[in-house]
């Protein structure tokens, strides 16, 4: 592990209570193909344990969704990945809206520091799919 | 090659016969910007030759497509990437529907083992584009 | 840097003049979370300084956009990433249309050579968002 190849791929555990837009993640071989090798989970949120530049990627699919589902709902459904703690480093890293689609998927390179906790906020009133091939979130350390 | 940097980027060769939803891939410098360095092709399907965690990515664009094309067709057009052999390891890794769009693109980290053959199943009745900048599929070994 | 871990993540600076479809990028810690470590910017375009296979990724979000915005405009809005110079190596690497969506995001592996300049051409008449979590472009060297 001293090479710094920190890496994690997570699957959706559950959504938060009504006023909490965060998605709660889980990972580990017993759950399927998810894993944590370096980073760790803190109450369902991903915490970084090694400084560096990371590739962050995510896919979220809405449950029981058709192209009309997203347009039927007044509030736009948006997914934002950001650093939520420590508060001094709070920032949105990646943001996507579903519009008339049912899946968003993206990735980006970003510097992260030990202790950064990443949150994935799903705003709107549509439930995400928990299927492990439809909704997942991961990070990969790529260089110091 | 002993570093284990197995990597491949493939372009679409052709679709399967009517009852076979698999896409058939090809790769090699003579074909353009596709390549195989470690993994290999078995009858158009990608076979892994080294254990590890891989970043799998794909983009598929439908041919002669507009935002109304996908809604004109009754069966939803869906792309699934999975391990199709050996049968004991068969699983769907990544799945996306086109809904009212003409392109899907995503990526994920997943553990793969030597001998795993990845299949990309396009269900629905729309022909995918063969343009090399619109439809491609690749894997990258990232760590043991 | 001798390891060859060239990497860059850029944010949108501005669009080109009317007949120039290129997006102009900027990067550096003073600007936020963008950076250049190896590659360099030449008049807002990304120039590669080390041969190898790169993971290229991009996300572009249209400004003031709803699912009807893209369908209201006659010319389809398309994003193409390609090598634009040297002219002898000019090629489109990755292409996506927005259709009824407001964001495109994708990634691919491709061989790039020292001196290759990458251009990101946005055709259509819609302005892209300059928010750093909505529009970004990056490359990561992954192997020789």
């Amino acid at each position: 592990e001293s090479l710094g190849w920190d890496i994690a791929e997570l699957q959706l555990n559950h959504t938060g209570p009504q006023q909490d837009p965060r998605l709660y993640w889980q990972g580990g071989p017993a759950l399927g193909r998810s894993f944590l090798r370096g980073p760790e989970l803190d109450k369902g949120q991903l915490r970084i344990r090694r400084d560096g530049i990371y590739m962050v990627h995510i896919q979220v699919t809405l449950a029981i969704c058709s192209s009309t589902s997203t347009s039927r709902h007044h509030h736009p459904t948006t997914l934002a990945v950001g650093i939520c703690s420590p508060a001094s480093r709070s920032i949105s890293l990646l943001r996507l809206s579903f519009h008339q689609g049912c899946t968003i998927a993206s990735q980006r390179l970003t510097p992260l520091a030990r202790g950064d906790t990443l949150c994935t906020n799903l705003t709107g009133t549509l439930l995400p799919s928990r299927n492990t091939d439809e909704t997942f979130f991961g990070v990969q350390w790529v260089r110091p | 090659e002993s570093l284990g940097w197995d990597i491949a980027e493939l372009q679409l060769n052709h679709t399967g016969p009517q009852q076979d939803p698999r896409l058939y891939w090809q790769g090699g410098p003579a074909l353009g910007r596709s390549f195989l360095r470690g993994p290999e092709l078995d009858k158009g399907q990608l076979r892994i030759r080294r254990d590890g965690i891989y970043m799998v990515h794909i983009q598929v664009t439908l041919a002669i497509c507009s935002s109304t094309s996908t809604s004109r067709h009754h069966h939803p057009t869906t792309l699934a990437v999975g391990i199709c052999s050996p049968a004991s390891r068969s699983i769907s890794l990544l799945r996306l529907s086109f809904h009212q769009g003409c392109t899907i693109a995503s990526q994920r980290l997943t553990p793969l083992a030597r001998g795993d053959t990845l299949c990309t199943n396009l269900t629905g009745t729309l022909l995918p584009s063969r343009n090399t900048d619109e439809t491609f599929f690749g894997v990258q070994w990232v760590r043991p | 840097e001798s390891l060859g871990w060239d990497i860059a993540e850029l944010q949108l600076n501005h669009t080109g003049p009317q007949q120039d479809p290129r997006l102009y990028w900027q990067g550096g810690p003073a600007l936020g979370r963008s950076f250049l470590r190896g590659p360099e910017l030449d008049k807002g375009q990304l120039r590669i300084r080390r041969d190898g296979i790169y993971m290229v990724h991009i996300q572009v979000t249209l400004a003031i956009c709803s699912s009807t915005s893209t369908s209201r405009h006659h010319h389809p809005t398309t994003l193409a990433v390609g090598i634009c110079s040297p002219a002898s190596r000019s090629i489109s690497l990755l292409r996506l249309s927005f259709h009824q969506g407001c964001t495109i995001a994708s990634q691919r592996l491709t061989p790039l050579a020292r001196g290759d300049t990458l251009c990101t051409n946005l055709t259509g008449t819609l302005l892209p968002s300059r928010n750093t979590d909505e529009t970004f472009f990056g490359v990561q060297w992954v192997r020789p």
Partner: antibody
């Protein structure tokens, strides 16, 4: 096996409408689209319109004001109606199946044709 | 609309020889890595029959003596060796966009 059977009158009075039913077998209208094409000595083969598996239709702009295509999936029937026929609408009218790939827009199986004369 | 021009309007070929029919489109019918051009055969009193799709793909059940080639705006249907049952009219059709259009046809006769 795949078949498309057309039924409808061969004689239509000027300014009246033409109705043809295309009954299909060997495939489902929920999967395949059906095109309508006509053939006349003067104009050759002309594409008139298509009804997709979803029931959505596309028409040739030259006929859009007087053409209607609909279907009944449960009866495996496609209905073609053209209004205001004139002498230059004299032709053989065909229904034809779109191949499996919906965006291919070719025609792999054809009905036997309905020969239409416009006369009072 | 895309206009398809076929040539020749008619041709006479001896048994066993090669028949070549051309179809030129008023604009390219290539997109997405395919050429959206198809070929049909029609005999008197019968509907057209699909022979070739996407410029060069042989429809199931069609004899291998039929072949298609071309891209962009210029396409060719070849029949070799010509057999007696090949006497018919041949049409090209594009599907690059709506409306679909057909060529005017080429009548193949046997010498």
């Amino acid at each position: 096996q795949v078949q498309l059977q057309q039924s409808g009158p061969g004689l239509v009075q000027p300014s009246q409408s033409l109705s043809i039913t295309c009954t299909v077998s060997g495939f489902s209208l929920t999967t395949y689209a059906v095109h309508w094409v006509r053939q006349s000595p003067g104009k050759g083969l002309e594409w008139l319109g298509v009804i997709w598996s979803t029931g959505i239709t596309d028409y040739n702009a030259a006929f859009i004001s007087r053409l209607s295509i609909s279907k009944d999936n449960s009866k495996s029937q496609v209905f073609f109606k053209m209004n205001s026929l004139q002498s230059d609408d004299i032709a053989i009218y065909y229904c034809a199946r779109n191949p499996y790939y919906g965006n291919l827009n070719a025609m792999d199986y054809w009905g036997q044709g309905t020969s239409v004369t416009v006369s009072s | 609309d895309i206009v398809l021009t076929q040539s020749p309007a008619s041709l006479a070929v001896s048994l066993g020889q090669r028949a070549t029919i051309s179809c030129r489109a008023s604009k390219s019918v290539d997109t997405s890595g395919y050429s959206f051009m198809h070929w049909y055969q029609q005999k008197p009193g019968q509907p057209p029959k699909l022979l070739i799709y996407l410029a060069s793909n042989l429809e199931s059940g069609v004899p291998a003596r039929f072949s298609g080639s071309g891209s962009g705006t210029d396409f060719t249907l070849n029949i070799h060796p010509v057999e007696e049952e090949d006497a018919a009219t041949y049409y090209c059709q594009h599907s690059r966009e709506l409306p679909l259009t057909f060529g005017a046809g080429t009548k193949l006769e046997l010498k």
